[in-house]
């Protein structure tokens, strides 16, 4: 429990006075917050938060999903917390299977435990397959398992959280990691033809091909020295993972002399931008 200097507001005090509490499923959770300026209890689990204005928090029959952090706050905005594990042998994990990782960043596999006293909390590949050799992770029973520095090669990796309970390995439900690639180069852009010579009234159509690692690449056709929004049509394909192609087709159904000029296909991603131009000359 917190120690205080006289005269200064102090954080609330919680009974039982420990940072973690383990209760069995079906048992009672009883938490008392003592503070003259008590405001509320906040209960934060994986999925949502709840509030309680009573200074005693009672859950008569604890369930695994009552596992989480209980925080008592006073009128000074000071708080104190206790983490409650509701031990349920039938429900060792509280999984959220939405799992996205940004390349080169860490990502959390959300499978917090309901029992911190199980052993060998780790990740395992599905169907007995080994995990990639370079996959590193850090387990945290209250949050889940953090995968360090996600690699592009981990895309669509199937894995389970795993613990040993009474000598047996217990697996969570399946998680499938979806990796969003980091842009490490500018998009590759090309144009179907570098210049066009047309008669008035003929159709002008030009296609720009944009290639990048994901559909997050931005592209547009622009007319040089003009802000006018050009009408374009898109087709796109994923040629396997991290090999995305878009075709942006610009069409002027009946070209006029004053449509002559330079048209630029511009593409950008978070790494940088690229462009390619085509010249249209319309004659009488």
């Amino acid at each position: 429990q917190p120690s205080v200097s006289p005269g200064e507001p102090s954080p609330p005090s919680i009974h039982p006075g420990k940072s973690d509490l383990i209760v069995r499923v079906g048992d009672e959770i009883r938490l008392l917050c003592t503070d003259p300026g008590f405001v509320k209890w906040t209960f934060e689990i994986l999925d949502e938060t709840n509030e309680n204005k009573q200074n005693e928090w009672i859950t008569e029959k604890a369930e695994a999903t009552n596992t989480g952090k209980y925080t008592c706050t006073n009128k000074h905005g000071l708080s104190n917390s206790i983490y409650v594990f509701v031990r349920d042998p039938a429900k060792l994990f509280l999984p959220d299977r939405s799992l996205y990782g940004k390349e080169d960043n860490d990502t959390l596999v959300r499978c917090p435990l309901t029992d911190p006293e199980v052993t060998n909390y780790s990740l395992k590949g599905c169907q007995g397959k080994p995990l990639p050799k370079d996959l590193r992770f850090i387990p945290d029973p209250k949050a889940g398992i953090m995968i360090k520095s996600v690699k592009r090669a981990y895309h669509r990796l199937c894995l389970h959280c795993s613990v040993d309970q009474e000598g047996k390995s217990v697996l969570s439900e399946k998680f499938i990691l979806k990796v969003r690639p980091a842009f490490k180069a500018v998009p590759v852009v090309s144009v179907s033809k570098a210049s066009y010579l047309l008669r008035e009234g003929e159709e002008f159509t030009v296609t720009c091909t944009i290639k990048d690692v994901s559909s997050s690449v931005y592209s547009t056709w622009k007319r040089e020295n003009s802000q006018t929004k050009l009408q374009e049509k898109y087709n796109s394909w994923h040629h396997g993972d991290f090999n995305y192609e878009r075709q942006a087709t610009l069409t002027i159904s009946s070209a006029r002399v004053n449509d002559s000029g330079v048209f630029m296909c511009y593409a950008n991603n978070t790494f940088g931008s690229a462009n390619v131009t085509t010249t249209l000359e319309v004659v009488d």
Epitope: N50, P95, D96, S98, K102, C126, C158, K174, I176, H238
Partner: antibody, heavy 117, light 111 residues
């Protein structure tokens, strides 16, 4: 419980832009991805994009790239979507939806955007 | 883009009987046996409400009259028996691949 609050309606002029909000409560805002969905009688439900929890990265449906911009303010637990260069085709109901355990488990009530001169 | 085709576009079912709605994907939405297909119910003036997730899992609070089945490209939502309150439009949705897509919807009328 989990709530996503959206303003009921926005009336905007063609060519203008609109920024709509989605205020989240009842959960830890920074732990969940927020998606945006457009609904029109003609096109049905269309996924616009997602703002990812924590780092604020975004991913868009190419159809809405350059048209919609997704942002979030962690301090107020509010997600925003701005739509620019509005035309009559942008008149629709726009929903925010929280992704939980692979699915859209919670939806806002929707904002009706009407584009009219 | 993965295209989801729902059929029928509308159907009328008598109270107490079974309603079956189909959703066909233009390519598989499965990874390692997980089908990233979900079903929603929408009533006029309301947002969609999740009924079934990952093809066959009943969302908490949804009556057991609703069930989902299928894998890869072919999925089915079944309501048995149908009740008056089930009159609504039903949508399938995939989030296996960006961009996430929805089916065109099936309007259910109760006779």
């Amino acid at each position: 419980q989990v709530q996503l609050q959206q303003p009921g309606a926005e009336l905007v002029k063609p060519g203008a832009s609109v920024k709509m909000s989605c205020k989240a409560s009842g959960y830890t805002f920074t732990s969940y991805n927020m998606h945006w969905v457009k609904q029109t009688p003609g096109q049905g439900l269309e996924w616009i994009g997602v703002i990812y929890s924590g780092n604020g990265d975004t991913s868009y449906n190419q159809k809405f790239k350059g048209k919609a911009t997704l942002t979030a303010d962690k301090s107020s637990s509010t997600a925003y979507m701005q739509i620019n260069s509005l035309t009559s085709e942008d008149s629709a109901v726009y929903y925010c939806a929280r992704e939980r355990d692979t699915r859209f488990g919670n939806w806002g009530q929707g904002t009706l955007v009407t584009v009219s001169a | 883009n993965i295209v989801l085709t729902q059929s029928p576009a509308s159907l009328a079912v008598s109270l107490g009987l079974r309603a079956t709605i189909s959703c066909r994907a233009s390519e598989s939405v499965d990874i390692y046996g997980n089908s990233f297909m979900h079903w929603y119910q929408q009533k006029p003036g309301q947002p969609p409400k999740l009924l079934i997730y990952l093809a066959s899992n009943l969302e908490s609070g949804v009556p057991a009259r609703f069930s989902g089945s299928g894998s890869r490209t072919d999925f089915t939502l079944t309501i048995d028996p149908v009740e008056a309150d089930d009159a609504a439009t039903y949508y399938c949705q995939q989030n296996n691949e960006d961009p996430y897509t929805f089916g065109g919807g099936t309007k259910l009328e109760i006779k």
